[in-house]
Amino acid sequence: IWELKKDVYVVELDWYPDAPGEMVVLTCDTPEEDGITWTLDQSSEVLGSGKTLTIQVKEFGDAGQYTCHKGGEVLSHSLLLLHKKEDGIWSTDILKDQKEPKNKTFLRCEAKNYSGRFTCWWLTTISTDLTFSVKSSRGSSDPQGVTCGAATLSAERVRGDNKEYEYSVECQEDSACPAAEESLPIEVMVDAVHKLKYENYTSSFFIRDIIKPDPPKNLQLKPLKNSRQVEVSWEYPDTWSTPHSYFSLTFCVQVQGKSKREKKDRVFTDKTSATVICRKNASISVRAQDRYYSSSWSEWASVPCS
Amino acid sequence: RAVPGGSSPAWTQCQQLSQKLCTLAWSAHPLVGHMDLREEGDEETTNDVPHIQCGDGCDPQGLRDNSQFCLQRIHQGLIFYEKLLGSDIFTGEPSLLPDSPVAQLHASLLGLSQLLQPEGHHWETQQIPSLSPSQPWQRLLLRFKILRSLQAFVAVAARVFAHGAATLSP
């Protein structure tokens, strides 16, 4: 058993049929010595008396808010949550496996630049009685500070018969050094509590590996005289790190016909313009990637050829 | 060339070669990013790899003030990785093809380090480890990890030279 926060405790249980459970001793936070009784949740049934209460925690029915009273007055509370371990593995019932980039990916994180700011998100099908708490650091043995905000519900989607809820959190490294070569990864830890079930999820990454620039901005076409060719130009996204002579991007320009089956013409360039042939009903798209490190491409920015 | 007295390197040449290094480092092991290669330290682990750190002056401001500190650190790293790519981690079993990207990477690391280091002047360099793994798959795993680190190192070096070529070239 360990303390998650004040008056909230997590009991770690091996979860299998007829498991013996864990013996837990609760102590009433009071100078009083006698006349103390204990109840669980809203029930008025007295579970025991005395300054301490010993309980055998085996299942969710044994978890909940234990309260000690004296003469009708509440003295203190202890909320017990359960953390299930099945076959040596901690349960992951609350969050959905996003399966990208690999199985057992519960947390996904992205950064728009090298400023030390990043966003993580996760999915669940649970709609109520759900709380999240997020902590982060750079490195684990001698951790350097990363400040995370509160997790918020960022999207709701319908997936077949189920509703899926996306939560996200923004974090910022306290003393970020955008030009340095990272040697210690960022660690993100999410505590999830659903009703009386506790779970924790972790992710470890370098900012460089989760970089995904915003799409190029101000995408424009300029027809070239007496030619089917056009000059496409664009700019670095506002959110990208500066100066651009140091934090450089490379670009992919694509000409795509109306039909998905039509052959795509692609050009790669380090410049912020390119000359391409504009076909009727086609569209021109441009995306960006860090020039020197193969992290994710941005989403496409597009304009119609006409 | 980066002479100790502080004259400038051939920024444009360095830019071109460092960008080529980035391409080669990724073609040497493109899928390495999808592998779980996290390091687990214990009380005995020491990190002898020369990383480009915050105080090394490799940021745009630091380069403008005095690029020598940064260039020295980059040179140190280039020599370190060049030695590693020539060690039995990469030359032992399983064998690499003579024209593999690793062979080109090895040659390019040497080329860039020579652009930075004039004859007769020697910056101190990190020693590569002497105790070497005995099993082929141990070497294979280390290759992936070394290439992963090299990708990060040469990315920073390439940014430095691109910025230098754009802003510090005579």
Epitope: - | D36, E39, T45, V49, I89, L131, P133, S134, L141
Partner: antibody, heavy 127, light 108 residues
């Protein structure tokens, strides 16, 4: 903390097969080397083979080649050892063991010395 | 295969005494890829020494390893009651990774 939890004891008939599992909790499973070592009653230790899950490729002691198959499932952090054509002399406690991490420069890699062991699985082969 | 021969097969000593266990290899063990383990009845082995002379995490200083090439030694400077067990050496220089047959350290 990190532990290796093995499946329970098995009683098998000669000629049959046995598959023992070894589940790792905590730590990085993928780039570790998981070995299988057996110990017949009152006898010494015998290395059978091992696998590095990230590569999925196992290596085996010549003595067991063709009779043993070692596999790993990265998604569940579980390694498996299957031994076929069982005979009475295969009666033993079978251990899975994780390699100690060595350092090469700044990179860790698994040594062939085993610093974490499962609790052992007794396999009895009897007609 | 590299054959490891441990001697003596049994060592009878009293608590406080010094124990010297030998492990001889049939061919040279490169880079000192040799380990020592302790095993007590009904338990899994425990790594004591790796790289011939480095103590594993949490192993008391009374355990030390030495040697190179084909001759290796495990020394317990002053036997504690919990040290009475069987000790195995193992080479990891070549596959198969072989173990010695063990030395049992028993109370005299």
């Amino acid at each position: 903390q990190v532990e290796l939890v093995q499946s329970g004891a098995e009683v098998k008939k000669p000629g049959s097969s046995v598959k023992v599992s070894c589940k790792a909790s905590g730590g990085t499973f993928s780039s570790n080397y998981i070995s299988w070592v057996r110990q017949a009653p009152g006898q010494g230790l015998e290395w059978m083979g091992g696998i590095i899950p990230i590569f999925g490729h196992a290596n085996y002691a010549q003595k067991f080649q063709g009779r043993v198959t070692i596999t790993a499932d990265e998604s569940t952090s579980t390694a498996y050892m299957e031994l076929s054509s069982l005979r009475s002399e295969d009666t033993a406690v079978y251990y899975c063991a994780r390699s100690k991490k060595g350092m090469y420069g700044g990179w860790t890699y698994p040594l062939m010395m085993f610093d974490l062991w499962g609790q052992g699985t007794l396999v009895t082969v009897s007609s | 295969d590299i054959v490891l021969t441990q001697s003596p097969a049994t060592l009878s000593l009293s608590p406080g005494e010094r124990a010297t266990l030998s492990c001889r290899a049939s061919q040279s063990v490169s880079s000192n890829y040799l380990a020592w383990y302790q095993q007590k009845p009904g338990q899994a082995p425990r790594l004591l020494i790796y790289y011939a002379s480095r103590r594993a995490t949490g192993v008391p200083a009374r355990f030390s390893g030495s040697g190179s090439g084909t001759d290796f030694t495990l020394t317990i400077s002053s036997l504690e009651p919990e040290d009475f067990a069987t000790y195995y050496c193992q080479q990891t220089s070549n596959t198969p990774f072989t173990f010695g047959q063990g030395t049992k350290v028993e109370i005299k």
